[in-house]
């Protein structure tokens, strides 16, 4: 008798590796010989797909290598076309071992930064990922922690984090291991000595320490009132990531002595710096109310006029006199703007070397100010009009109240270079010489108030004045 | 993230010594200056000294000038100031601060950074 | 020393009100004048440096100028957290001067 069909085991959940064999049973009785058709994901299952194998009249579906995109639900459906039609569906679910598929690399990092070591796992159930340090597993803390994709993050990173680290992934089917990696911790230079400031008589021998620590090991360069040291023997050594490094010194001269620490860090470099400054008992009578010290220029507005690395003297008049002396001359730079191109370089310099004198560095820090002819030849050669009118408004108070701080040097005040070369300073970017200045009309009413002398040249100047230039 | 964390105030005898430390992190040392404020019960505030750390170079008040003493350890970004001959009126809370240098900016730069403040008291 | 003259010395105003704090100060100190905020119990905030520049994160609200040597804090529109002690700074010559305070107060 014909009897319509009955699905007598019905489909369950079936677990599969990947590339492994799965197979879905659909049993069925009935009369006729129904026909069974299989559906994943309620799209149908083609009887020529050469990934599937449909045996026993269709009642047996084999997925002959399972895919991880073969995961879905399979239904079998059976009609003969008495009664209804009859389905059963069960779920594949594709189990997969843990897979590393971005494992962790090698890392240079800077000490304080943030480090984050990739481990990106696949696998089904979900791989749980811990992570070893060396031979033990790495505890999680404040500053590290195991991301939800599995990355390890380090945040401040400190230099007993550095070491070889390797992720584990984890789940019920098995363990894979990434390649171990390299944490490297790189740490800024940092001066842990400083030398040390001395008070010696004249022909005395110093020796100046300096010990500096960093990953890499820094270099140690010590460098004079701003030149790189020229005389004196250094001694280095280095241990346990420390350098230490000795300059002996004939000190016939007083004197800044920078030891500057260096390393590098990919394509970048990190310096420290320490400073001492060696006076000669005797060495300069002090002057009155010259209260200050000495420092190397490290501001903005002067660079290009101040001889690099320049030893000024920085008053303490001022509460903070770097940032006071920086920003007097920023603002006469803004009220040089409008002056001629001939009078600007030279008011510059003369303004530089004016507020940020060169300094003496003996028992008492002393600046050494400007040489008069050099005052005198900004005043009646490269800056005459603008001179006279600067003079007239600081007198009929016409200037913004903060330029009568500036105190315009008085050039008959100042000392003569034929008097004592040593007394006064020169200001190299002036570069001419009198057979120049013969061309130029007489700027004032009456000659210089002294000879101005052949200036020394100077290769490095950023102009000079020739018989082109006009001032009238 | 830049932090200053006073220490060392306290309960001190007239003509007592304290020393406060202030240690300094999430910036370069070199590149700025130690400043220490106080304030006195119910009163404002006053500047007492400072230490630029890249030329240790140093001012005070003269209210404590040959009594108090600034310093810096650069290498433990730490500053310090020394307080001897203590006096009742030195009674406050010691601030430090700092101020950076930006030069570039071509401003001048206020305190934008405070410790929390350690209280000292000099009382018999 | 330079004497920073601070007025006035406390002040009563509503949420919303606009306040003027000003600081003249005994000789010239270029803009070298800040401006701090200060909450009973906690370290001064610094609000304005050099005279008129605002202090970033602080709200814009708070605005600083100068004419000549008198300098001037606003508050262009007072809300609550607002109600605190403010002060003066000038940093141009040694000794470094705060003013004497303002108190902020609610009306």
């Known amino acids: 008798l014909p009897k319509a069909p009955v699905i007598t085991t019905p489909l369950e959940t079936v677990d599969a590796l990947v590339e492994e064999v799965a197979t879905f049973m659909c049993a069925v009785e009935s009369y006729p010989q129904p026909e069974i058709s299989w559906t994943r994901n309620k799209i149908l299952i083609k009887l020529f797909d050469t990934r599937y194998s449909i045996r026993e009249n269709g009642q047996l579906l084999t997925i002959l290598s399972v895919e991880d995109s073969d995961d879905g639900i399979y239904c079998c459906t059976a009609n003969n076309g008495v009664g209804g039609a009859v389905e059963s569906c069960g779920a594949l679910q594709v189990k997969m071992k843990p897979k590393i598929t971005r494992p962790p690399i090698n890392v240079k990092i800077i000490e304080g930064l943030k480090a984050v070591l990739p481990c990106t796992t696949m696998g089904n159930p979900k791989p749980s990922v811990s992570w070893i340090k060396g031979d033990s597993p790495l505890r999680e803390n404040s500053r590290i922690a195991v991301l939800e994709s599995g990355s390890l993050r380090i945040h401040n990173v400190q230099k007993e984090d550095a070491g070889q680290y390797r992720c584990v992934a984890k789940n019920s089917l098995g363990t894979a291991y990434s390649k171990v990696v390299k944490l490297e911790v790189e740490v800024f230079a940092r001066i842990l000595r400083a030398p040390e400031s001395h008070n010696v008589t004249f022909g005395s021998f110093v020796t100046l320490h300096c010990t500096a620590t960093g990953i890499p090991v820094p270099t140690i360069t010590w460098i004079e009132n701003g030149n790189a040291v020229s005389s004196g023997s250094i001694q280095e050594s280095v241990k346990d990531r420390v350098i230490d490094s000795r300059l002996q010194l004939f000190i016939t001269k007083p004197g800044l002595y920078t030891c500057i620490a260096t390393n590098k860090h990919g394509e970048k470099f990190s310096t420290a710096k320490a400073a001492a400054t060696i006076s000669i008992a005797e060495w300069s009578k002090p002057q009155k109310d010259n209260k200050g010290y000495c420092a190397q220029y490290r501001g903005e507005v002067c660079n290009a006029v101040l001889a690099k690395d320049a030893l000024v003297f920085l008053n303490t008049s001022y509460a903070d006199p770097e940032e006071a002396q920086e920003l007097l001359v920023h603002t006469a730079w803004n009220e040089l703007k409008v002056v001629s191109p001939v009078c600007r370089p030279a008011a510059e310099a003369l303004l530089c070397n004016h507020i940020f004198q060169e300094c003496s560095p003996g028992v008492v820090p002393t600046p050494i100010p400007i040489c008069r002819e050099y005052c005198l030849a900004v005043k009646e050669l490269f800056c005459a009009k603008e001179w006279l009118v600067m003079e007239e408004k600081t007198h009929r108070g016409l200037y913004r109240s903060e330029m009568h701080l500036l105190s315009v040097p008085e050039c008959s005040k100042l000392p003569s270079m034929h008097w004592d070369p040593t007394a006064c300073a020169r200001l190299p970017h002036l570069d001419y010489n009198k057979e120049n200045l013969k061309t130029f009309p007489p700027m004032t009413s009456s000659k210089p108030s002294v000879d101005i002398p052949n200036l020394p040249s100077s290769s490095s100047s950023s102009f000079s004045v020739s018989p082109t230039y006009s001032m009238t | 993230e830049v932090q200053l964390v006073e220490s060392g105030g306290g309960l001190v005898q007239p003509g007592g010594s304290l020393r406060l430390s202030c240690a300094a992190s999430?910036?370069?040392?070199?590149?700025?200056?130690i400043h220490w404020v106080r304030q006195a019960p119910g009163k404002g505030l006053e500047w007492v000294a400072s230490i630029s750390s890249s030329y240790s170079s140093t001012s005070y008040a003269d209210s404590v000038k040959g009594r108090f003493t600034i310093s810096a350890d650069t290498s433990k970004n730490t500053a310090y100031l020394q307080m001897n001959s203590l006096r009742a009126e030195d009674t406050a809370v010691y601030y430090c601060?700092?101020?950076?240098?930006?030069?570039?900016?071509?401003?001048?730069?206020?305190?934008?950074?405070w410790g929390q403040g350690t209280l000292v008291t000099v009382s018999s | 020393d330079i004497q920073m003259t601070q007025s006035p010395s406390s002040l009563s105003a509503s949420v919303g009100d606009r306040v003027t704090i000003t600081c003249r100060a005994s000789q010239s100190v270029s803009s070298a004048v800040a401006w701090y905020q200060q909450k009973p119990g906690k370290a001064p905030k610094l609000l304005i440096y050099s005279a008129s520049s605002l202090y970033s994160g602080v709200p814009s609200r708070f605005s600083g100028s100068r004419s000549g040597t008198d300098f001037t804090l606003t508050i262009s529109s007072l809300q609550p957290e607002d109600f605190a002690t403010y002060y003066c700074q000038q940093s141009l010559w040694y000794p470094v001067t705060f003013g004497q305070g303002t108190k902020v107060e609610i009306k």
């Open positions: 999430g910036f370069t040392f070199s590149s700025s200056s």
């Open positions: 601060a700092r101020k950076y240098y930006r030069w570039r900016h071509n401003k001048y730069q206020g305190f934008d950074y």
